[in-house]
Interface confidence: low
Amino acid sequence: MMTGTIETTGNISAEKGGSIILQCHLSSTTAQVTQVNWEQQDQLLAICNADLGWHISPSFKDRVAPGPGLGLTLQSLTVNDTGEYFCIYHTYPDGTYTGRIFLEVLESSVAEHGARFQIP
């Protein structure tokens, strides 16, 4: 039975040209995290593999930085970066946990961070 929950930064907003940290945290389980995938819609952004370390997809190398921790930093944001982002935790023996973050990239200088929320 999967007992864990993923806490994410939830709905967040940031300014065009700026940067933002996407963060997920898996709790309430003793399962071993073997890999975390970061995806935007159907595109793979990055992988953090417990054995092999970080890999950033070639098309995002200039604008994506690993960390902090298992999180991901997006840089030089554009309005096109607005959308859903997913952290996918591969664990043993539980299986896969997925967290969702919605990022809105704003033209103006008013960018507020949303509340944190949990996905069971």
Epitope: T34, E39, D42, L44, I47, N49, L52, G53, H55, S57
Partner: antibody, heavy 122, light 106 residues
């Protein structure tokens, strides 16, 4: 040229142990992870796990914990697979296979040993 | 673990035929897929990695394509030495192999 040479075939009784060796040559042994792959008679390929040849840290696939141990002797560029408490279902060809590097991009198996047949029979 | 499903399991073809083998992943694996050829009594041989990159020394009649969950290995003109079993292999996560496709002489 780069190659992996494995030890010869083994015939063992149930409950015994076996140690298969895989000697690398033609490249820097510690620069590439080593995998172990099992192929039961008439069956497909099954990844058993791998060992980081830099640190000696092993990673075991599901179903290959407990009786299976990966080890190294870097002084002779050799990886080892030891299987204890052998069962009839361990009868298979065991391959060592080099991974192309330590990043996910390179994680295909570019060099394989010739395979070692382990037969477990009473 | 990520499951790989190969189709067909068996394929009968003639020398000169164009042959296509499909590999489907249970979840998106980007382009982290390799293809191997195995002949009876021999070790597998790497043909394609990163879904479409030909391994050094492999004939150009072999090609790979696909991304995400669906991949194909194509042999443009089957040669006598190509009759063998072919396996796909995902390399994004803990490695898994497809069940294999045996290419036999018609």
């Amino acid at each position: 040229q780069m190659q992996l040479v494995q030890s010869g075939s083994e015939l063992k009784k149930p409950g015994a142990s076996v140690k298969v060796s895989c000697k690398a040559s033609g490249y820097t042994f510690t620069s590439y992870p080593m995998n172990w792959v099992r192929q039961a008679p008439g069956q497909g390929l099954e990844w058993m796990g791998w060992i980081n040849t830099n640190t000696g840290n092993p990673t075991y696939a599901q179903g290959f914990t407990g009786r299976f141990v990966f080890s190294l002797d870097t002084s002779v560029s050799t990886a080892y697979l030891q299987i204890s408490s052998l069962k009839a279902e361990d009868t298979a060809v065991y391959y060592c296979a080099r991974t192309g590097g330590y990043s996910v991009d390179e994680y295909s198996f570019d060099i394989w040993g010739q395979g070692t047949t382990v037969t477990v029979s009473s | 673990d990520i499951q790989l499903t190969q189709s067909p399991s068996f394929l009968s073809a003639s020398v000169g035929d164009r042959v296509t083998i499909t590999c489907r992943a249970s979840q998106g694996i980007s382009s982290y897929l390799a293809w191997y050829q195995q002949k009876p009594g021999k070790a597998p041989k790497l043909l394609i990695y990163a879904a479409s990159t030909l391994q050094s020394g492999v004939p150009s009649r072999f090609s790979g394509s696909g991304s995400g969950t669906e991949f194909t290995l194509t042999i443009s003109s089957l040669q006598p030495e190509d009759f063998a079993t072919y396996y796909c292999h995902q390399t994004i996560f803990r490695p898994t192999f497809g069940g294999g496709t045996k290419v036999e002489i018609k």
